[in-house]
């Protein structure tokens, strides 16, 4: 599914992808939050920025994608496939697959989806902030 390895992407391309992911993450979270009475869980943590948070490896794309693919097994909200497709663009072809256990209890499924969706949305905000501040530093 990968057309170009990540290192062929320009920082401006990466920023465009992250901007799109930020927008999609907000849509996903908005829809997930329609399910009232579900609380965020402390049991799940989505990896976000890489230690150096520099393009092209600004975020832990393979791990994030693995979490979104797990959500996709549980839910077919329309934006999830698109999010996964965008994350694919930010992944090296030889990236190892992260294993995530799928919750089986109905309520725990909903908590997992809400928690990861919220963390993903926050992560995209951070990634975009990091990219834009890095771009400003590069021009000064």
């Amino acid at each position: 599914s990968h057309t170009l390895p990540v290192h062929f992407l320009q920082p401006s391309d990466i920023q465009k992808i992250v901007e799109e992911l930020q927008s999609l993450s907000k849509m996903l979270l908005k829809d997930v939050k329609e399910d009232k009475g579900v609380l965020v869980s402390q049991n799940y943590t989505l990896p976000c920025l890489t230690p150096d948070a520099q393009p092209p490896n600004i975020i832990h794309s393979p791990a994030i994608r693995a979490y979104l693919k797990t959500i996709r097994q549980l839910d077919n909200k329309s934006v999830i496939d698109e999010i996964i497709e965008h994350l694919d663009k930010l992944i090296f072809q030889d990236a190892p697959e992260t294993n995530i256990s799928v919750p089986t209890d109905t309520h725990e499924c909903k908590r997992f989806i809400l928690t990861i969706s919220q963390q993903f949305s926050e992560c995209m905000d951070l990634a975009l902030k990091s990219l834009t501040s890095g771009a400003q530093q590069a021009t000064t």
């Epitope: 829809d31 997930v32 329609e34 077919n76 909200k77 329309s78 109905t106 499924c109 909903k110």
Partner: antibody, heavy 124, light 110 residues
């Protein structure tokens, strides 16, 4: 009591158009489910036509054969989903159902809801 | 194109018989599978969702199993009211698979 009610069926000539409506009552349009149109020709099986997502984006998925002639849309203020059918042919004669499906695999069967169907007859 | 292959297309059985209907997807649908019963002039009635969960009000003689691409509906002891047509359906959604129904299995009296 949640209900889906189809309307707009009837007799139409080949090449004609028809717009079917699927009105939701007992629940309001919000995220986390899809509304789909399914048809059943006399004595035949169920055939999926198209689905629309009820949420942030009105994403749509069409059966390959339905693209071009059939168009799904929704009006949140009226709690209604529509199916616009153009260039109708005799083989489009069928009972047209609308149905609601959960977007979550974990959800209870209350998310599976079908209307009673509306008959469309294409004949000269 | 994505396909759901249901078999057999028809079967004849007697009251008390154990009946098995299979549904095979052309690619994995992650248990996004429902089974319906339909009688003439009526909309389909949900029996099983998420491959194996019994819908409310459905007798326990109906059961579903399977994962990945292969799924089964079993009626442990056929009752007079069970003579009908049965359909499998995927509601996976998304652009890569879409939605769809099996071709149906008509269960008639032997």
């Amino acid at each position: 009591q949640s209900q889906l009610v189809e309307s707009g069926g009837g007799l139409v000539q080949p090449g004609g158009s028809l717009r079917l409506s699927c009105a939701a009552s007992g629940f309001s349009f919000s995220a986390n489910y899809w509304i789909c149109w399914v048809r059943q020709a006399p004595g035949k099986g169920l055939e999926w036509i198209v689905c629309i997502y009820i949420g942030s984006r009105a994403d749509t998925y069409y059966a390959p054969w339905a693209k071009g002639r059939f168009t799904i849309s929704k009006d949140n203020s009226k709690n209604t989903v529509y199916l616009q059918m153009n260039s109708l042919r005799a083989e489009d004669t069928a009972v047209y159902f609308c149905a609601r499906f959960s977007s979550g695999i974990y959800d209870l069967d209350r998310f599976f809801l079908w209307g009673q169907g509306t008959l469309v007859t294409v004949s000269s | 194109a994505f396909q759901l292959t249901q078999s057999p297309s028809s079967l004849s059985a007697s009251v008390g018989d154990r009946v098995t209907i299979t549904c095979q997807a052309s690619q994995s649908i992650d248990s996004w599978l429902a089974w319906y019963q339909q009688k003439p002039g009526k909309p389909p009635k949900l029996l099983i969702y998420q491959a194996s969960k019994l819908a409310s009000g459905v007798p326990s003689r109906f059961s579903g199993s399977g994962s990945g691409t292969d799924y089964t509906l079993t009626i442990s002891s056929l009752q007079p009211e069970d003579f009908a047509t049965y359909y499998c359906q995927t509601y996976y959604g998304g652009g890569h698979i879409g939605w769809g129904f099996g071709t149906g299995t008509k269960v008639t009296v032997l």
